[in-house]
């Protein structure tokens, strides 16, 4: 191992993956197992993050970089750097203190995470419900009720065929 020669701070020459060992006359010593230093000149190495239980290892710890975790299947990451794991639910459910619970009538969730959201109120946009909502899916809004009055067609007529060489109007 290299004995540092810097006149200012003998530790400044210690590279990432080592620490400046005061117990050994400020020699650069490699980080012990399960620890790392990501920058040079450090006087200690940091303990590697352990990915266990709800976490699983995405990237192993090395002498120069910390381990990275994601979540064990059945859970998903929350927070910066996957600092927490939260339970998945099925579509049509939301997570509560009591675990996964079905969405109440009039609400839906089309994902494995997040909360149940109210169905779209089609009438606010002057439209009618074309497809009813479910616990897993929002309603589909269609034409306004006036457009569906007797004699009115709910099907959009086809656009007139264009002759070759003519640009659309």
């Amino acid at each position: 191992f290299e004995r540092t020669r810097s006149l200012q701070d003998p530790c400044s020459n210690c590279p990432a993956g080592t620490f400046c060992d005061n117990n050994r006359n400020q020699i650069c010593s490699p980080c012990p197992p399960n620890s790392f230093s990501s920058a040079g000149g450090q006087r200690t190495c940091d303990i590697c993050r352990q990915c266990k239980g709800v976490f699983r290892t995405r990237k192993e710890c090395s002498s120069t970089s910390n381990a990275e975790c994601d979540c064990t299947p059945g859970f998903h990451c929350l927070g910066a750097g996957c600092s927490m794991c939260e339970q998945d639910c099925k579509q049509g459910q939301e997570l509560t203190k009591k675990g996964c619970k079905d969405c109440c009538f009039g609400t839906f969730n089309d994902q494995k995470r997040g909360i149940c959201r109210p169905w779209t109120n089609c009438s606010l946009d002057g439209k009618s419900v074309l497809v009813n909502g479910t616990k897993e899916r929002d309603v589909v809004c269609g034409p306004s009720p006036a457009d569906l009055s007797p004699g009115a067609s709910s099907v959009t007529p086809p656009a007139p065929a264009r002759e070759p060489g003519h640009s659309p109007q």
């Epitope: 929350l78 927070g79 600092s83 794991c85 939260e86 339970q87 509560t96």
Partner: nanobody, 123 residues
Amino acid sequence: QVQLVESGGGLVQPGGSLRLSCAASGFTFSNYWMNWVRQAPGKGLEWVANIKEDGSEKYYVDSVEGRFTISRDNARNSLYLQMNSLRAEDTAVYYCARGGEGYGDSHYGMDVSGQGTTVTVSS
């Protein structure tokens, strides 16, 4: 260093009982919701039960309701899971997990868990 260590697992016959323990250290145990989660062989992780900081609220997944009881002793920094009327489908590795800051308010994420203890229910 924050640490959770589970113990108490083992082999038990169907209908039998086990009591799991989780020893917490490195943080103020009484300030956190705590959880038990489990992973059956070849399956995803499943939440089992949780308990509020002071033990005043307890919740369970439907499949263990009435058979399992979660409890805590804040003076001893310990979490427990009393498992009665065990079934083959309870066979799993059981993990103790801490609810992260804001658990129960803005999220239900867990930020620390232990190595797990194995429960095998078989005749």
